[in-house]
């Protein structure tokens, strides 16, 4: 069954863009006019989970690639990774839990909480060129993003 998908670019609240730096890693950095098209476009799918007034369950794929953000436990710590999937099976409305994020809108910003690991969020560092990671909203890490809609 086809599921609803929308396409977005994400920037963190410092206006850092997200780029694919090697086959399986996203990094956050400031882009200028010349290389602005390097930033990834996310395919956001509305998937199985518990929606509420402030939380919407979504999966985040990279448009044009068979890659999805997923959350797994590595060495005892919830970890964000890019996972390769079978394009014939994904996206689907009932994604495995590791692919599901609760999209939380806070004022004009949005946060992405792992459904598998509550209170762990897609995060960026203050520093430039650092990997996007799963953080527990501690210290100076950035969890607020803005979404720019991209026509399909």
């Amino acid at each position: 069954v086809p599921i609803r998908q929308l396409h977005y670019r994400l920037r963190d609240e410092q206006q850092k863009s997200l780029v694919l730096s090697d086959p399986y890693e996203l990094k956050a950095l400031h882009l200028n006019g010349q290389n602005i098209n390097q930033q990834v476009i996310f395919s956001m799918s509305f998937v199985q989970g518990e929606p509420s007034n402030d939380k919407i369950p979504v999966a985040l794929g990279l448009k044009g690639k068979n890659l999805y953000l997923s959350c797994v436990m590595k060495d005892g710590t919830p970890t964000l990774q890019l996972e390769s999937v079978d394009p014939k099976q994904y996206p689907k409305k009932k994604m495995e839990k590791r692919f599901v994020f609760n999209k939380i809108e806070v004022k004009s910003k949005v946060e992405f909480e792992s459904a598998e690991f509550p209170n762990w969020y897609i995060s960026t560092s203050q520093a430039e060129h650092k990997p996007v990671f799963l953080g527990n909203n501690s210290g100076q890490d950035i969890i607020d993003f803005t979404m720019e809609s991209v026509s399909s």
Epitope: V1, P2, Q48, G49, E50, P51, Q89, K92, K93, K94, E96, K97, R98
Partner: antibody
């Protein structure tokens, strides 16, 4: 309050086609998936398939070659057709709603229709 | 095809805790759901998304899901909890039910 009311022929001969319809009363029709499940006498539940308001379907692979689920949004109804029935298709057939608020699972069920296949 | 395995029967004394298991390959990677069915009635959803209760379902019903096993727990079991219980999960493109467990409340 959501209600699912189902009907259809209760007695079939082998090789005939089973046809059941489920009408939905209350609540939006387009915001949900609509499913059919069956239960042979004294046995467990078996998921048959589902449809959304646009007509997109998923079927159980074991039944896919014989099953058609269709939808009539103007009447808030959906239907099940199962061809070439045998005695093994004797079961109580349920229609149900899959809701996003319960994680796309079956939160409202019809009353069930016993379908008997016998020569 | 995917398989979810449940014990055929579980017995419990009134007021005690009943645990019904559902096992399947990497079931913990997916969301698990539980239904209660009493004789002659349609199934009723009692647990969704592993551990959440629909409105109207008593607090004594709880669920968990990790590894290869989902568990439905009924604490302070009452006579009216006697029923068949089915687990369910999604298998790529279709739903799969467990074979069902008959819960008997003794006495």
């Amino acid at each position: 309050q959501v209600q699912l009311q189902q009907w259809g022929a209760g007695l079939l001969k082998p090789s005939e086609t089973l046809s059941l319809t489920c009408a939905v009363y209350g609540g939006s029709f387009s915001d949900y998936y609509w499913s059919w499940i069956r239960q042979p006498p004294g046995k467990g539940l078996e998921w048959i398939g589902e449809i959304d308001h646009s007509g997109s379907t998923n079927y159980n692979p074991s039944l896919k070659s014989r099953v058609t689920i269709s939808v009539d949004t103007s009447r808030n109804q959906f239907s099940l057709s199962l061809s070439s029935v045998t005695a093994a298709d004797t079961a109580v057939y349920y229609c149900a709603r899959a809701s996003p608020s319960s994680g796309w699972t079956l939160d409202y069920w019809g009353q069930g229709t016993l379908v008997t296949v016998s020569s | 095809q995917s398989v979810l395995t449940q014990p055929p029967s579980v017995s419990v004394s009134p007021g005690q805790t009943a645990s019904i298991t559902c096992s399947g390959d990497k079931l913990g990677d997916k969301f698990a759901f539980w239904y209660q069915q009493k004789p002659g009635q349609s199934p009723v959803l009692v647990i969704y998304l592993d551990n959440k209760r629909p409105s109207g379902i008593p607090e004594r019903f709880s669920g968990s899901n990790s590894g290869n096993t989902a568990t439905l727990t009924i604490s302070g079991t009452q006579a009216l909890d006697e029923a068949d219980y089915y687990c369910e999960a999604w298998a790529d493109t279709y739903e799969v039910f467990g074979g069902g467990t008959k819960l008997t409340v003794l006495g």
